[in-house]
């Protein structure tokens, strides 16, 4: 005859409050005849939390149907979950006897503790801009967890970042855990449209891990390159002189232009262009008269981005005599 | 030259863990993260996971994540791989591999260049 | 995760002849801000680890032969062998490292005709 052994599969089950927990309890053999019941604890202290022929268990109910003859499951739901739950639960086999039934075996228990799911995570970049090259910090930030056990990972876009530092508090034992965690990168010319994404798993998500996000688009400035060239072709005794700023962000730009070192008040014309990695391109045209009486024309293009040191290409007009000709055969 | 020379064969039961070893030379074990990807007989690559050495973070795949554990030794520029609870298709040849560089904090994931293996055969 | 798909799984080439394998994802490997397909290939050769042959989809690493070759963009990727060599018998992989867990193509064995 097969002895009985009573299986109680989870050491530890995770609820939160409000929802309903099942304690799962099967046994491996009907005899001996007699009832199975549950409780709390162990020791003469012990609570009842179960038993099918006598009390009011109103917020108990039973898996299976206790009733059928060859049931082997003696599993239960416990509803409404509220912190006054939590302890370890036991399922116990009696033996049926005369005047009262005797403890036969017990299960080896199953500790119910109360989980609860973090928070979304908050990730927060730096206060201000950084050029490409240098280093970035973002904080990510998670609370109110339980257990303790947490996993937090990083990436940049789809790549995983290895350059952390992360704490979980309290160190003790506590209701509630938090989570805090540090990480460095560096940021590529690139980078307006990627983003930091800080990734938290917990058992309380059921492997659907809980996602923060921050643009690097916040964090980063990308620095303009300037040229100024001079075109070819003129329109009657005008030369047309274009400053090209390219591949900068954030769009924030102030462009002058100043001829010999005079600021120049005129409208000039300019278009604006986003590049695919996020970036902008900007175009702006000045148109230059030629006479006689203009020999030296220094064209400087200055530009002041998102707030910093203004940079400024200059260039030294070409205009030649066969140019001078043309424009005072021009000229009625 | 750069060299990861790992560990010797081992055989296991079922429930055990193993231990892999890998030492690296040749370039500055700290300025570059390592990662462990494993072949079973016959069959094709798969990666494990990653390990910087300067930090010490590390970052599992899903399929291994609560059994395997990187850590490092930088007094003498080795990395280990342990995997516990093996089982019979854990059987294969572990290999450490070369990433990219820490310094951008960004793990790039091509492998150059890798150790000589280590087999490791889970029979009961 | 990113699923990566080879084919054909084997090959037999004529010494001095081209072979071509192809290997496709499941999603695109280009970052289009830097305007870069995140795949490596491997050679590996029986008893032998891998070893690198291109990465960024198409950049040859050093002391890697001239005949060895990757193209393509997105999805859709291959490694070419201009003229087979003796040497070059071995199992082909591509990798992409776009995204983590990084996977691996199942393999495609190049043979002598």
């Known amino acids: 005859e097969e002895e009985l052994q009573m299986i109680q599969p989870e050491k530890l089950l995770l609820v939160t409050v409000g929802k309903t927990a099942t304690l799962h309890c099967t046994v491996t053999s009907l005899l001996p005849v007699g009832p199975v019941l549950w409780f709390r604890g162990v020791g003469p202290g012990r609570e009842l939390i179960y038993n099918q022929k006598e009390g009011h268990f109103p917020r108990v109910t039973t898996v299976s149907d206790l009733t059928k003859r060859n049931n082997m499951d003696f599993s239960i739901r416990i509803s409404s979950i509220t912190p006054a739950d939590v302890g370890t639960y036991y399922c116990v086999k009696f033996r049926k006897g005369s005047p009262e039934n005797v403890e036969f075996k017990s299960g080896p228990g199953t500790e119910m503790a109360l989980g609860a799911k973090p928070s979304a995570p908050v990730v927060l970049g730096p206060a201000a801009r950084t050029t490409p090259e240098h280093t970035v910090s973002f904080t990510c930030e998670s609370h109110g967890f339980s257990p303790r056990d947490i996993t937090l990972k990083w990436f940049k876009n789809g790549n995983e970042l290895s350059d952390f530092q992360t704490n979980v508090d309290p160190t003790g034992q506590s209701v509630a855990y938090s989570i805090r965690s540090t990480a460095r990168v560096v940021l590529d010319p690139w980078d307006v449209r990627s983003q930091v994404i800080c990734e938290v798993a917990h058992v309380t998500l059921q492997g659907d891990p809980l996602r923060g996000t921050a643009n690097l688009s916040e964090a980063i400035r990308v620095p303009p390159t300037l040229e100024v060239t001079q075109q070819p072709m003129r329109v009657g005794n005008q030369v047309n002189v274009t400053c090209q700023v390219r591949k900068f962000y954030p769009q924030s730009l102030q462009l002058t232009w100043s001829e010999n070192g005079n600021v120049c008040q005129r409208e000039t014309a300019s278009t604006l262009t986003e590049n695919k990695d996020g970036t902008y391109n900007w175009t702006s045209w000045f148109l230059v008269n030629i006479s006689d009486q203009r020999d030296d024309v220094v064209l400087t293009c200055q530009v002041k981005h998102d707030g910093q040191l203004a940079v400024s290409k200059r260039l030294a007009l070409e205009v030649t005599v066969h140019q001078k000709d043309q424009s005072s055969d021009a000229t009625p | 030259q750069v060299q990861l020379v790992q560990s010797g064969a081992e055989v296991k039961k079922p429930g055990a863990s193993v231990k892999v070893s890998c030492k690296a030379s040749?370039?500055?074990?700290?300025?570059?993260?390592m990662h462990w990807v494993r072949q079973a007989p016959g069959q094709g690559l798969e990666w494990m996971g990653w390990m910087n050495p300067n930090s010490g973070n590390t970052g599992y795949a899903q399929k291994f994540q609560g059994r395997v554990t990187m850590t490092r030794d930088t007094s003498t520029s080795t990395v280990y791989m342990e995997l516990s609870s093996l089982r019979s298709e854990d059987t294969a040849v572990y290999y450490c591999?070369?990433?990219?560089?820490?310094?951008?904090?960004?793990?790039?994931?091509?492998?150059?260049?890798w150790g000589q293996g280590t087999l490791v055969t889970v029979s009961s | 995760d990113i699923v990566m798909t080879q084919s054909p799984d084997s090959l037999a080439v004529s010494l001095g002849e081209r072979a071509t394998i192809n290997c496709k994802s499941s999603?695109?490997?280009?970052?289009?801000?830097?305007?870069?397909?995140?795949l490596a290939w491997y050679q590996q050769k029986p008893g032998q680890p891998p070893k690198l042959l291109i990465y960024?989809?198409?950049t040859r690493e050093s002391g890697v032969p001239d005949r060895f070759s990757g193209s393509g963009s997105g999805t859709d990727f291959t490694l070419t062998i201009s003229s087979l060599q003796a040497e070059d018998v071995a199992v082909y992989y591509c990798?992409?490292?776009?995204?983590?867990?990084?996977?691996f193509g199942q393999g495609t064995k190049v043979e002598i005709k």
């Open positions: 990798q992409q490292y776009y995204s983590s867990p990084y996977t």
């Open positions: 591999a070369r990433g990219g560089r820490v310094v951008r904090g960004v793990i790039k994931g091509w492998f150059d260049p």
């Open positions: 999603q695109s490997l280009l970052y289009t801000s830097n305007d870069r397909n995140y």
């Open positions: 040749g370039y500055t074990f700290t300025s570059y993260h």
């Open positions: 960024w989809a198409s």
